[in-house]
Interface confidence: low
């Protein structure tokens, strides 16, 4: 077992994106037993690395306040695509 | 938008090497993670590598990890493949594509790409 915080970060849409990669899903669980969606590799420079809250690892639980739970990668990814330039996110950090 | 023109296929003999670029106009193309695919003749377009926007990280099919290399010139707006070794299974029609948002898990499908080229042809002879 293991504690984990929920922050919300805002981030402002760079010339690269959001900046980091996401896996999980329905069909590709990332976690055992968890179809949850998870930051797997931030991009130096990109804009979540330059607001440093995100980390490897953290759980994105909801984008603009839309949940990510039981949802395919693809539809994931297509939620990302169409946040916009003000994405609000919802994370779990592991401490 | 994006627009995406491959260059540098040929005909070259099994063994041989060639060098293909890819030119991104309209937008740089440090704005896109970008992956190359090819399509032999009558066979489903498949994976072949792809490089994420900043070019920290590469990714390859089995089918040509230790062959082929990706880079990128984000000054230029350009990715390069560069293919050594070549077999004559590595003949097909090599695209180009550009994708906005980048997810490690689907760096083989087609289908998360958003802009692609017209594809050059690449032929390697016994």
């Known amino acids: 077992d293991y504690l984990v915080t929920e922050e919300e970060i805002n981030l402002t849409r760079g010339p690269s994106g959001l900046g980091f990669n996401i896996v999980g899903g329905t069909d590709q669980q990332y976690v055992s037993n968890d179809s949850g969606i998870y930051v797997s590799e931030i991009d130096e420079n990109g804009a979540a690395a330059l607001d440093g809250r995100l980390q490897e690892g953290d759980k994105i639980l909801s984008v603009n306040g839309q949940d990510l739970k039981n949802l395919l990668h693809q539809d994931a990814v297509d939620l990302f695509r169409n946040a916009g330039y003000a994405v609000s996110l919802r994370v779990q950090h592991r401490l | 938008h994006v627009q995406l023109v491959e260059s540098g296929g040929g005909l070259v003999q099994a063994g041989g090497s060639l060098r293909l670029s890819c030119a991104a106009a309209g937008r740089t193309s440090s704005d896109y993670a970008m992956g190359w695919f090819r399509q032999a003749p009558g066979k489903e377009r498949e994976f072949v590598s792809a490089i994420n926007w900043s070019g920290i990280s590469t990714y390859y099919a089995d089918s040509v990890k230790g062959r082929f290399t990706i880079s990128r010139d984000n000054a230029k707006n350009t990715v390069h493949l560069q293919m050594n070794s070549l077999k004559p299974e590595d003949t097909a029609v090599y695209y180009c594509?550009?994708?906005?948002?980048?997810?490690?898990?689907?760096?083989?499908?087609?289908?998360?790409?958003?802009?692609w080229g017209q594809g050059t042809q690449v032929t390697v002879s016994e």
């Open positions: 594509a550009a994708e906005k948002l980048e997810s490690l898990r689907n760096w083989h499908d087609p289908l998360m790409y958003d802009y």
